[in-house]
């Protein structure tokens, strides 16, 4: 009967990776991650899911928690137990038949009439099981999400299993297997679903390809749509000329008229449902793209872009509290202090560490190139619509940072914000930048949940100084219409360039129906929904897209003039665009967090053959998403058929090892003597949590086959990574599943499915 | 072909553990998604829970705290623990490729009976 | 404990039309196509027939059909056949349980 099964390699941090125990996801699947040696059997956190991550399985270290690309599927809810059968098995009479005796032998399946079994024994309630994944439920917001952003945020609920909306766990409660757990539960959902025969390695799709020297390119700028308007150069006037608030002048700089100069507006939960999918995704103007945070979406999505460039040392400190400080659940807050959203996985798993050191702006007249790190939050407000101010309003700006040649690749040493969730650490690979001559440009496009509504949020470092985002270009909204894709500076694979709908943001995880394969950027379209192949109804998750502007120097400084110029003190400039003046540029670029809370995408319909196949499996090594489990497997594709979803993720086996992830430590900043400075070229810090977004019924992807998101983690290990290829049903809404493991179990299920299907 | 073999007792005294290996072939347990399914003399079958193709382990919420799954790559095979039997734990015990929705390929079922 | 409800018997006549119901909820059939089908013989293992809610499974005759509407999926024979005669299983993945059966549906062939 095995039909072709798709081998859908969904790739899933396991908390092993990062040295995270069972990652025990809300719901009742303990996602038992085995690290090393499946053989271990007391590994099992959640009931369902315990993640284990064998190491031993898999060539590669299975612990490896960073993921590239997160789908965003991984979303399950925890799984409940049913103790009926087991105790209807009591009630039968105990035959004893002999050792080996088969159940053919033992005449077990000679079920007596099912009639009177039918809903009796069968119906039991399930036990306690169903837990509201926090970590998970994180997950299933938009992908991308960070923990902390999402910690932060008191509003952000974790979102259950589809019903499960804001129910978040304690922190504590999360799901254990941070790694694994999240995703686990798509990928046992996938494999629920059928486990189609996954056998081999996840494919990684065309464009699961991950760039060559990916981790160590700088391409800051691959996610810029090099048609987008970004040329402007980052800075019109120093920003302490214009008088105005620092962030404000450097906003407006960089900013691209049209674009919210803040970047960060607080995404409903259900913009994607509500956005129109169709939204032309190449639209220049953003603002009205993204959905007023007041819409009713249960949650909003901020997502925050932050673009810190790289700063000398001594502001990169101030930097690294400034993503502390500046995201909700500042780095002492604990996941539970962080708020729902970080209870996805980092329920137990260490509260993603504040992102990486974010230089303050540098001196004034100091020509210090920075690389804008770009730290896409996207925090999603809960229902209440609450959420981390902070996190609401920041707009990415792009600026162009010369690279200097003799500095040293940056590598955030601190792991991004939520990086310290053990499904997020951040590994990317330091990125050295390119030659000074090519800018790299990483521009971060603020998510937009309507052309108003944007807030902006001002980080603050430790200090409490604010850190000024140098825009940079803004990106047009059809660049980067959708708040969830934001470009995340070379380093991250290059990610489908999903021409977003400028009317609509992606959920973080909305990505599925963005990049299309065939969009430019794209690796080639991977579908990534973890599940996707499975359940194709479920978790379109669309993954943000990284985008990382092609490295060469020549489109990056096509992109933005880079001025030899020192950037004017940023601390002084303020954005004139919109609220951006809130928009606090960091130093460090290249540090992308995109946090999505759950969306709400249940209202999205994707368009069948639109873009929101997000195949693109950010690759690059430094990004981590961390995706939480998107739970897609409600959504179907209904324009393809499952038969649609045989794009195997990472176009081969992709297993993503966690070990790999952690580059930050290892990476020395290259950069002048910025050493110290987080930013990574390349968005070397580029944590990208996406929660998996389960899309429920109401959400349609765009892609035929609903969007498949290919969960690719920069690494590929052998059983680490579940393969997260869920398809999106049209019809499937996005819904958080109770525990990222069931999450990841879905996408097993889907995984399983989609093999079947091959 | 695709093929999975249970092996282990079967015959478990009560509150000891039931252990299990289901032998794969064909395919690996590393690629592919493995489930435990059992089913009770005239019941409807009971997933166990799996061990994912990405590494995870996935366990029933009503045994989780009894279950352990394990999986060795090595020998492609994936081991069921069940720990503190009781006689309702008698069933025929099923490995499969898959999870739950599109398990594929079964085991022919090994008989367990939980027994004093 | 089953969660999910199917008939407990659905009976035809050769060459009709047969159709066996899942009902489920948000959680498990209704969370996405994360539904499958289990025809099992008494004795046998149960045998795959449909994943992904409407996908055959690979020698699954084409009478043999899926759907999923809501919380409630379907398994239709178009045309019953007598070697059609089993215990249907509906399965699926359940965000809480992670994976549930039916309650099993007998079909008679008459």
């Known amino acids: 009967m095995a039909e072709p099964r798709q081998e859908f390699e969904v790739m899933e941090d396991h908390a092993g990776t990062y040295g995270l125990g069972d990652r025990k996801d809300q719901g009742g699947y303990t996602m038992h991650q085995d690290q090393e040696g499946d053989t271990d059997a007391g590994l099992k956190e959640s009931p369902l899911q315990t993640p284990t991550e064998d190491g031993s399985e898999e060539p590669g270290s299975e612990t490896s928690d960073a993921k590239s690309t997160p789908t965003a599927e991984d979303v399950t809810a925890p799984l409940v137990d049913e103790g009926a059968p087991g105790k209807q098995a009591a009630a039968q009479p105990h035959t004893e038949i002999p050792e080996g005796t088969t159940a053919e032998e033992a005449g077990i399946g000679d079920t007596p009439s099912l009639e009177d079994e039918a809903a009796g024994h069968v119906t039991q309630e399930p036990e306690s099981g169903k837990v509201v994944q926090e970590g998970f439920l994180r997950e299933p917001g938009p992908p991308g999400l960070s923990h902390q952003l999402m910690s932060g945020m008191p509003g952000a609920p974790l979102l259950p299993e589809g019903p499960r909306e804001a129910t978040r766990q304690p922190s504590g409660t999360g799901p254990e297997d941070t790694e694994g757990g999240r995703h686990a539960p798509e990928l046992l959902k996938h494999q629920l679903l059928g486990d189609l025969h996954q056998e081999g390695p996840p494919l990684k799709g065309a464009g699961g390809k991950e760039r060559p020297g990916s981790k160590e390119e700088v391409d800051e700028d691959r996610d810029v749509d090099e048609s987008s308007p970004q040329d402007s150069p980052p800075s019109k006037a120093s920003p302490a000329q214009d008088g105005r608030p620092p962030q404000t002048a450097a906003r407006e700089a960089t900013s691209i008229p049209g674009f919210p100069a803040e970047g960060a507006i607080p995404l409903p939960v259900d913009f994607l449902s509500k956005v129109s999918t169709e939204i032309p995704a190449s639209e220049p103007d953003g603002p009205s793209v993204g959905r007023a945070k007041g819409q009713d979406a249960p949650l909003e999505f901020t997502f925050h872009v932050e673009i810190t460039p790289n700063v000398q040392k001594e502001q990169a400190h101030s930097e690294e509290h400034l993503g502390r400080a500046a995201f909700p659940g500042a780095p002492g807050e604990g996941p539970e202090a962080r708020g729902p959203s970080l209870g996805e996985d980092t329920k137990e798993a260490d509260l993603p560490e504040p992102s990486e050191k974010q230089p303050a702006a540098a001196p004034r007249g100091k020509p210090v190139s920075r690389v804008p790190q770009l730290k896409a939050r996207m925090v999603s407000k809960s229902k209440d619509g609450t959420g981390s101010d902070d996190k609401k309003a920041k707009t990415s700006t792009r600026s162009s940072a010369k690279t200097l040649k003799n500095r040293p690749c940056l590598s955030p040493k601190h792991p991004t914000p939520g990086s310290s969730d053990p499904l997020i650490q951040p590994s990317s690979p330091a990125v050295c930048p390119e030659p000074p001559s090519s800018p790299k440009y990483v521009s971060s496009v603020t998510s937009r949940t309507g052309s108003s509504g944007a807030k902006e949020m001002k980080l603050k470092g430790a200090d409490g100084k604010t850190k000024i985002a140098t825009p940079r270009g803004a990106a047009p909204p059809g660049q980067k219409g959708q708040a969830n894709a934001t470009r995340i500076p070379a380093k991250t694979p290059p990610a489908p360039k999903t021409p977003p709908s400028s009317g609509e943001p992606p959920k973080s995880g909305d990505r599925s129906g963005y990049s299309s394969p065939g969009s430019p950027g794209t690796p080639g379209s991977r579908s990534r929904t973890p599940s996707l192949p499975t359940p194709p109804t479920r978790e379109p998750k669309k993954v943000a897209v990284v985008r990382t502007p092609p490295k060469s120097p020549s489109s990056a400084k096509s992109r933005l003039q880079t001025a030899p110029v020192p950037m004017p003190d940023l601390k002084n400039v303020k954005s004139k665009i919109g609220s951006t003046e809130n928009l606090k540029h960091q130093p460090g670029g290249g540090k992308v967090q995109i946090i999505n809370k759950k969306l709400d995408l249940s209202n999205v319909q994707s368009k069948c053959g639109s873009k929101d196949n997000i195949k693109h499996v950010p690759g690059g090594g430094s990004v981590q998403i961390v995706y939480k489990p998107v739970d897609l497997s409600k959504v179907t594709s209904k324009c393809g058929s499952l038969g649609n979803i045989h794009h195997k993720p990472g176009g081969g086996q992709v297993e993503v090892k966690s070990e790999k992830l952690d580059f930050k430590d290892r990476v020395q900043s290259k950069i002048g003597s910025l050493d110290n400075i987080t930013h990574v070229p390349g968005g070397g810090n580029k944590k990208i949590e996406t929660h998996k977004l389960t899309f429920r019924e109401n959400a349609k992807a765009k892609t035929d086959h609903g969007a498949e998101i290919v969960y690719k983690s920069p690494v590929v290990s052998g059983d680490t990574s579940p393969r997260h290829l869920s398809n999106v049903s049209s019809t499937g809404s996005i819904d958080m599943v109770d525990s990222p493991q069931l999450a990841t179990l879905a996408d097993e299920v889907s995984a399983s499915l989609a093999k079947q299907g091959l | 072909q695709v093929q999975l073999q249970e092996s282990g007792p079967s015959l478990v005294k009560p509150s000891q553990t039931l252990s299990l290996t289901c032998t794969v072939s064909?395919?690996?347990?590393?690629?592919?998604?493995v489930a435990w399914v059992r089913q009770a003399p005239g019941k409807v079958p009971e997933w166990l829970g799996a061990s994912g193709s990405s590494g995870n382990k996935y366990y029933n919420p009503a045994l989780k705290s009894r279950l352990s799954i394990t999986r060795d790559t090595s020998k492609s095979q994936v081991s069921l623990s069940l720990s503190s039997v009781t006689t309702e734990d008698t069933a025929v015990y099923y490995c499969a490729r898959g999870i739950i929705a599109g398990v594929d390929v079964w085991g022919r079922g090994l008989l367990v009976s939980v027994s004093s | 404990q089953a969660v999910l409800t199917q008939p407990s018997s659905v009976s035809g006549a050769l060459g009709q039309r047969v159709s066996i119901t899942c009902s489920g909820s948000?959680?498990?059939?209704?969370?996405?196509?994360?539904v499958g089908w289990y025809q099992q013989v008494p004795g046998s293992a149960p045998k795959l027939l449909i994943y992904?809610?409407?996908s055959r499974a690979s020698g699954v005759p084409d009478r043999f059909s899926g759907s999923r509407s809501g919380n409630t999926a379907t398994l239709t024979i178009s045309s019953l056949q007598a070697e059609d005669e089993a215990d249907y299983y509906c399965?699926?993945?359940?965000?809480?349980?992670?994976?549930?059966f039916g309650s099993g549906t007998r079909l008679t062939v008459l």
């Open positions: 399965a699926s993945y359940d965000s809480s349980d992670g994976g549930v």
């Open positions: 064909g395919f690996s347990v590393i690629s592919d998604s």
């Open positions: 992904g809610a409407a």
């Open positions: 948000s959680s498990n059939v209704g969370y996405g196509d994360y």
